[in-house]
């Protein structure tokens, strides 16, 4: 059950979808990767606050339980839900290919 | 693809499987779970430092962009890769009811 | 839908070994907290639970019956199977096996299946 | 090995009418946990036997509310408020607790 969508931290502060601009150098496909040059990376970022887009039942354990030992157990953490797919154009032994991935960029988020 | 599973912080310093013992209380689940009384909680818990079992080439990019900017990307986090299923004998409107869940015990874990 | 389906030999000689099978389908015998039981039940007469198998493996058995039971199960056919060995005809019954939660919960039944000891 | 012990063994009732059934058992049944695995089933005439209380007064969905269950330490009663025809069988008190064991059974029938 995907749970409580309103941040108790503030706006923009709980886990959402953020984009991050990066080249084939930040990265380190510069030797394997043509096209694109730059990716413009959607990636999950943000707190699990109390049953804030819990992923799941183990999410909710998990904040049941860092509440009681937070030392022992972290907190839900952010991560992507579901990808959308992204073509790279990219070298190979025998020439050029264009390959699809489909868990390189994050589409929406939660918490688990 | 899932990368190294050698930690370089040392022996279960990284993301790995862990069980947490927890009571119905400890979970928020006494007025309505009759059985069982505690839960052998598994939970990913650990560190994911560089390609420590790199969930996909979402969690790769993450690494390279955390090494980058580690104030504006967080580094991967450890969370289940999959899960086992468990029953919860439970307190319903209409009476007692037997309840499998799929997403409560973790089974194994990696980083994303 | 859950079902649990028993199957044996029907009929059997003094002393020689009783094998049951449970084949069970609506549900996965590695769920943790569930488990199988068999119980077993002479004609006119009451029940008699004589084994258990949890989902990580661990067995009961009844303590008056221990020496001649071994249960086990193959989660890959979904099947917990009973062995009964030096079968008297005192162990004639309808031997039934049962889905069980934890420490009972018996929420789900086989129709049963006649076995019978007889020379 | 705990013996759980019913009474009456055999219980004629009239429809529409209440029945009780007593379940002794031989020693506490509160298991270490701090659980009363006392359960009641039903086998009704020429049928596998159904699941009606679960820990001692936990109706099952599905099962009328004219069944209640009752006690706790040794002393156990399943009441039905008004017999009816349906209800015609063998009753078993049943405990989790120890080495599981069922009571020797009470059979309800119509008069």
């Known amino acids: 059950a995907r749970n409580g969508d309103h941040c108790p931290l503030g706006p923009g502060r709980c886990c959402r979808l953020h984009t991050v601009r990066a080249s084939l150098e930040d990265l380190g496909w510069a030797d394997w990767v043509l096209s694109p040059r730059e990716v413009q990376v959607t990636m999950c970022i943000g707190a699990c606050p109390s049953q804030f887009r819990a992923a799941n039942m183990h999410a909710q354990i998990k904040t049941s339980l860092h509440r009681l030992k937070p030392d022992t157990v972290p907190a839900p953490c952010c991560v992507p839900a579901s990808y959308n797919p992204m073509v790279l154009i990219q070298k190979t032994d025998t020439g050029v290919s264009l390959q699809t991935y489909d868990d390189l960029l994050a589409k929406d988020c939660h918490c688990i | 693809a899932r990368n190294g599973d050698h930690c370089p912080l040392g022996p279960g310093r990284c993301c790995r499987l862990h069980t947490v013992r927890a009571s119905l209380e400890d979970l928020g689940w006494a007025d309505w779970v009759l059985s069982p009384r505690e839960v052998q909680v598994t939970m990913c818990i650990g560190a994911c430092p560089s390609q420590f079992r790199a969930a996909n080439m979402h969690a790769q990019i993450k690494t390279s962009l955390h090494r980058l900017k580690p104030d504006t990307v967080p580094a991967p986090c450890c969370v289940p890769a999959s899960y086992n299923p468990m029953v919860l004998i439970q307190k319903t409107d209409t009476g007692v009811s037997l309840q499998t869940y799929d997403d409560l015990l973790a089974k194994d874990c990696h980083c994303i | 839908q859950v079902q649990l389906q028993e199957s044996g030999p029907g009929l059997l000689k003094p002393s020689q070994t009783l094998s049951l099978t449970c084949t069970v389908s609506?549900?996965?015998?590695?769920?943790?907290?569930?488990?199988v039981s068999w119980i077993r039940q002479p004609a006119g007469k009451g029940l008699e639970w004589l084994a258990h198998?949890?989902?990580?493996?661990?067995?009961r058995y009844n303590p008056s019956l221990k020496s001649r039971l071994t249960i086990s199960k193959d989660t890959s056919k979904n099947q917990v199977s009973l062995k009964l060995s030096s079968v008297t005809a005192a162990d004639t019954a309808v031997y039934y096996c049962?889905?069980?939660?934890?420490?009972?919960?018996?929420?789900?039944w086989g129709q049963g299946t006649t076995v019978t000891v007889s020379s | 090995d705990v013996v759980m012990t019913q009474s009456p063994l055999s219980l004629p009732v009239t429809l529409g009418q209440p029945a009780s059934i007593s379940c002794r058992s031989s020693q506490s049944i509160v298991h270490s946990n701090g659980n009363t695995n006392l359960e009641w089933y039903l086998q009704k005439p020429g049928q596998s036997p159904q699941l009606l209380i679960y820990k001692v007064s936990n109706r099952l969905s599905g099962v009328p509310d004219r069944f209640s269950g009752s006690g706790s330490g040794t002393d156990f009663t399943l009441k039905i408020s008004r017999v009816e025809a349906e209800d015609v069988g063998v009753y078993y008190c049943f405990q989790g607790s120890h080495v599981r064991t069922f009571g020797q059974g009470t059979k309800l029938e119509i008069k």
């Open positions: 609506g549900f996965s015998l590695i769920t943790s907290g569930l488990g």
């Open positions: 049962a889905r069980g939660g934890y420490d009972g919960y018996y929420d789900y």
């Open positions: 198998i949890y989902w990580d493996d661990d067995k």
